[in-house]
Interface confidence: low
């Protein structure tokens, strides 16, 4: 019959060329000499000359290697005419399907991917996604099926498997507990994309994971004990500056200190504010002290942060002994 089943041709064929693919044959050749020709893109229209046909035998020829990524399917028409040029058959559809070879390696869409995750998160938390593409066929073959993996992690602390990557989606997740910004603020992962679903060509990219600060460090007084001297009757007088250290990210709500007088100020004589730059607690007199009434005050000050703690942390307390100094007051009549 004047019919040709779809022809499969692997791309990148080594030849030798021209290569015989299939034979067109009309049963009208019993009655008359038949001349065969082909038309369509790849034959007589661009890209011209990829295919040809032997006029008398009907052999369909491939003249050069094919590239599936350029053209995956050719649709040609076969023609049969008699010696006098009269058509002896209707034009026949010839489908040539170019089958894939693994001739492209995966390519990451970026050289460097960036993501972030909060310190202390639970294993299973998603961080970011990396993407690689492969021009090869991922539908009918594994040539274009990309599998992702993590090749290396820097630094390797607290150990070298802090993250995992989903083989097929490229989603990077936390796999281990122990992310601590104060110890490791950033991880650099070398990620790989390998075609053939992990068995073929490999390419690499970098994934940078920034560890975001959580309020997992309490501010601590340093020192914890202070002695101060204040003249009696002075209002708004700076009594003492209290210093704290906090390992969380400077100038963030997790670092900024909030001070509270917890005890020893029964008469509400003192107030404490936070210095906006140094984070120190500035203890001042709210109203005048009376040496004759009480010559020493022992204050207990607690420090927390503007942001709540993300886990239960001990609160640091400072003790300030304030000595009230006598001032020679005019006699009262």
């Amino acid at each position: 019959d004047w019919v040709v089943a779809p022809i499969s041709v692997p791309e990148n064929g080594k030849g030798p060329f021209p290569q015989r693919l299939n034979q067109l044959k009309s049963n009208k050749d019993r009655d008359t000499k038949i001349f065969y020709s082909i038309t369509g893109p790849g034959a007589d229209s661009p890209p011209e000359g990829v295919f040809a046909v032997e006029k008398e035998t009907g052999w369909l020829l491939l003249n050069k290697p094919l590239d599936r990524e350029e053209i995956a399917k050719y649709e040609l028409f076969g023609h049969a005419v008699s010696e006098n040029g009269a058509s002896v058959e209707d034009p026949m559809n010839i489908s040539i399907i170019v089958t894939d070879q693994n001739d492209h390696k995966p390519k990451f869409t970026q050289d460097t991917f960036r993501g972030s995750v909060l310190e202390g998160v639970m294993p299973g938390t998603s961080v970011m996604q990396v993407t690689a593409t492969d021009e090869d066929d991922a539908v009918n073959t594994y040539n274009g099926v990309v599998a992702y993996s993590i090749h290396s992690q820097e630094p390797k602390e607290p150990h070298d498997l802090m993250f995992t990557i989903h083989k097929s989606t490229g989603t990077i997740s936390v796999i281990s507990s122990g992310l601590d910004r104060e110890k490791v603020p950033e991880y650099r992962l070398t990620v790989q994309a390998t075609d053939m679903d992990g068995e073929g060509s490999t390419t690499t990219a970098e994934a940078v994971v920034q560890i975001l600060d959580a309020n997992d460090n309490a501010p601590e007084f340093d020192p914890q004990k202070y002695e101060a001297h204040v003249p009696e009757n002075a209002v708004g007088h700076e009594v003492q500056r209290l210093t704290v250290t906090d390992l969380d990210a400077p100038n963030s709500p997790a670092w900024r200190a909030t001070y509270l007088i917890m005890g020893g100020d029964d008469g509400d004589h003192f107030t404490i504010t936070t210095h906006p730059e140094s984070n120190q607690g500035i203890l001042t007199t709210r109203k005048g002290l009376d040496f004759e009434a009480k010559n020493q005050h022992t204050l207990y000050v607690e420090v927390t942060n503007e942001a709540p703690f993300v886990l239960k942390l001990p609160t640091s307390t400072a003790t300030i002994v304030v000595h009230v100094e006598d001032v020679n007051e005019a006699p009262v009549f």
Partner: antibody, heavy 121, light 107 residues
Amino acid sequence: VQLVEESGPELVKPGASVKISCKASGYAFSSSWMNWVKQRPGKGLEWIGRIYPGDGETKYNGKFKGKATLTADKSSSTAYMQLSSLTSEDSAVYFCARQRDYGALYAMDYWGQGTSVTVSS
Amino acid sequence: ELVMTQSPASLSASVGETVTITCRASDDIYSYLAWYQQKQGKSPQLLVYNAKTLAEGVPSRFSGSGSGTQFSLKINSLQPEDFGTYYCQNHYVTPFTFGAGTKLEIK
């Protein structure tokens, strides 16, 4: 296919840099690797590295990292190699050579005529 | 890096003779071996790739064979234009490496 190394013989002073060009014609420049090969006088061939002009990907022989920098200009179908901090050891003929991208496992089928670089004060 | 060991380093032969040059790879390179011919002052020319495929325009008196780590290039009925230096090259793994060359001289 033709690869023409347009720069003539180069005479350069130690410590200087030189940039060699290789103009391609007769094939899809972007879709083939361009390799660079060094040949010292009377010596054998030494592979420096290659570039895929399509996306600029480069691969270097470790020995030439920091010495050679490969670039390509798709618009003019020209590949370039810059050699820096030149010493007498860099005096050689440098060839560009095309490599078709069948998984980059192909031989170098077309070569430029070579550019002679002489480093001398 | 992969080392390509070529032998002999030099060879004298007469027109009409048959010569064989061998090349050994320090690791398996399957069939990814090329042979080049270089004449004095000229660029190398590809003769054979994939161990045994003749490059376009190369006379059939040249033939390549081998796979894995052992390869050879055979030239039948030497012609005057065949004299020069021959190099083998691994085109499997980077850095691509060449043999040290075999200088074929006229006797």
